[in-house]
């Protein structure tokens, strides 16, 4: 039961995370105009990975796409690439993890196959989350660098009375969405990897069957084991107990002094 819960939760957390990464990638507010120096501006600028926008106080918003590819900063291209890679890996991970879910039965798929798929999706989620976090962090670093550069020469062309105030940009909402989403995807991936350990068949060096002698009056049924073909494929023994309130996931997998007959 614990494995199923861990796997399910990992899937849901990753799903939310990937949705967040997609949302962050599409959002226009990666960088927003810093209003510290000019809190009374009637024009508000903000920029995304794909377009820049201007919102006038009167309510009109105008957005213009970056229609050039070669003219864009390399860092912006890198951030775009990281976010897209994150989304693609996350999407594939979600697809794989759907089939790996313990609660979904697909033909006669063995637990070992599900375990492998769970691990694969988990690794994909981890890499996806890392890509998103890296992308957002690179963009944030770019903003910080530009912010202090523009602060250094805040007023350009101080010819006489005329002042030209440079527009400075600070962190936009998309950065925080991206960080949180990347973190969630990463956590979801870790949970999937943990669930994989619980799903994976235990390889033992003996063919003898074992049972737990618990404090309860447990009747041992020799016919209660599934036939096993050895150590390789499906060696996870499933026990049937008369008082069976436990599910297969709750069976302790650590050997105790009572384990061996």
């Amino acid at each position: 039961m614990a494995v199923t819960a861990c796997q399910g939760l990992g899937f849901v957390v990753s799903l939310i995370g990937i949705a967040g990464i997609i949302a962050a990638t599409c959002m226009d507010q990666w960088s927003t105009q810093d209003l510290y120096n000019n809190p009374v501006t009637a024009v508000f600028n903000y920029q995304g990975l794909w377009r820049s926008c201007v919102r006038e106080s009167s309510g009109f918003t105008e957005c213009r796409g970056y229609f050039t590819l070669l003219g864009l900063p390399a860092m912006l291209q890198a951030v775009r690439a990281l976010m897209i890679v994150g989304i693609v890996l996350g999407a594939i991970g979600l697809l794989v993890s759907i089939f790996a879910l313990k609660c979904i039965r697909i033909g006669s798929m063995e637990d070992s196959a599900k375990a492998n798929m769970t691990l694969t999706s988990g690794i994909m989620f981890i890499v996806s989350g890392l890509c998103a976090i890296a992308g957002v962090s690179v963009f944030a670093n770019m903003l910080v660098t530009n912010f202090w550069m523009s602060t250094a020469n805040m007023y350009t062309g101080m010819g006489g009375m005329v002042q030209t105030v440079q527009t400075r940009y600070t962190f936009g909402a998309a950065l925080f969405v991206g960080w949180v989403a990347g973190g969630l995807t990463l956590i979801g991936g870790v949970m999937m990897c943990i669930a994989c350990r619980g799903l994976a068949p235990e390889e033992t060096n003996y063919k003898a069957v074992s049972y737990h002698a618990s404090g309860h009056s447990v009747a041992y049924k020799p016919g209660g084991f599934k036939a096993s073909t050895g150590f390789g494929s499906n060696t996870k023994n499933k026990k049937i107990y008369d008082g069976g309130a436990r599910t297969e996931d709750e069976v302790q997998s650590y050997p105790s002094k009572h384990d061996y007959v």
Epitope: A42, N45, Q47, E56, S58, F60
Partner: antibody
Framework: QVQLQESGPGLVKPSETLSLTCTVS????????VSWVRQPPGKGLEWLGV???????NYHSTLISRLTISKDTSKSQVFLKLSSVTAADTAVYYC???????????WGQGTLVTVSS | DIVMTQSPDSLAVSLGERATINCKSS????????????LTWYQQKPGQPPKLLIY???TRESGVPDRFSGSGSGTDFTLTISSLQAEDVAVYYC?????????FGGGTKLEIK
């Protein structure tokens, strides 16, 4: 079509509060901002303040302590209140709709307010 | 506050001639985000409310004759009437629409010579 109409008392005593109403039609106050502008007799235009579609306001720095702009969206009305008036506040008061580029694209006919005892 | 300075205070031009009105702001009105200048020109005839002529420094409002044109960027702007008509006699105002308060220039009175 878009229309704005200012109304209010034409005469206000010094130290009292000047209250004006701008009734609009042809557009929604939730979508567009309305500015107040005044013009003393024989002088130029002076921007007083604005109330935007979202209800936020901006006031002229010299009037911020005396000026309040509010609105009743359901009645399509914008209100201006200017307290502690003096003879210097005598002017034609206009309300105007904010459009593209924050420009005032439609204006009311204006109402003359005289501050005198 | 941004100070808007118009010149000249008054201008007399013959019918059919070009009229040029200047406006200077104490700070740049150019928005880097969209490369637009937030300067507006109004025309006010005697006994009437002002009428919007040009916004974004050079974009003509619909219904405004094409003899009116705006130019300039940053801090220096110009309103040009290419061929003065009798109905163009009015006071012309420029306005900063970039930063609050949205200050007006002092106005330029245009007359026929």
């Amino acid at each position: 079509q878009v229309q704005l109409q200012e109304s209010g008392p034409g005469l206000v005593k010094p130290s009292e509060t000047l209250s004006l109403t701008c009734t609009v039609s042809g557009f929604s106050l939730t979508s567009y901002g309305v500015s107040w502008v005044r013009q003393p007799p024989g002088k130029g235009l002076e921007w007083l303040g604005v109330i935007w579609g979202d209800g936020s306001t901006n006031y002229h720095s010299t009037l911020i302590s005396r000026l309040t702009i509010s609105k009743d969206t359901s009645k399509s009305q914008v209100f201006l209140k200017l307290s502690s008036v003096t003879a210097a506040d005598t002017a034609v008061y206009y309300c105007a709709k904010a459009g593209r580029g924050n420009a005032l694209d439609y204006w009311g006919q204006g109402t003359l307010v005289t501050v005198s005892s | 506050d941004i100070v808007m300075t118009q010149s000249p205070d008054s201008l007399a031009v013959s019918l059919g001639e070009r009229a040029t009105i200047n406006c200077k702001s104490s700070q740049s009105l150019l928005n880097s985000g969209n490369q637009k200048n937030y300067l507006t020109w109004y025309q006010q005839k005697p006994g009437q409310p002002p009428k919007l002529l040009i916004y974004w420094a050079s974009t003509r409002e619909s219904g405004v004759p094409d003899r009116f044109s705006g130019s300039g960027s940053g801090t220096d702007f110009t309103l040009t009437i290419s061929s003065l008509q009798a109905e163009d006699v009015a006071v012309y105002y420029c306005q900063n629409d970039y930063s609050f308060p949205l200050t007006f220039g002092g106005g330029t009175k245009l007359e026929i010579k």
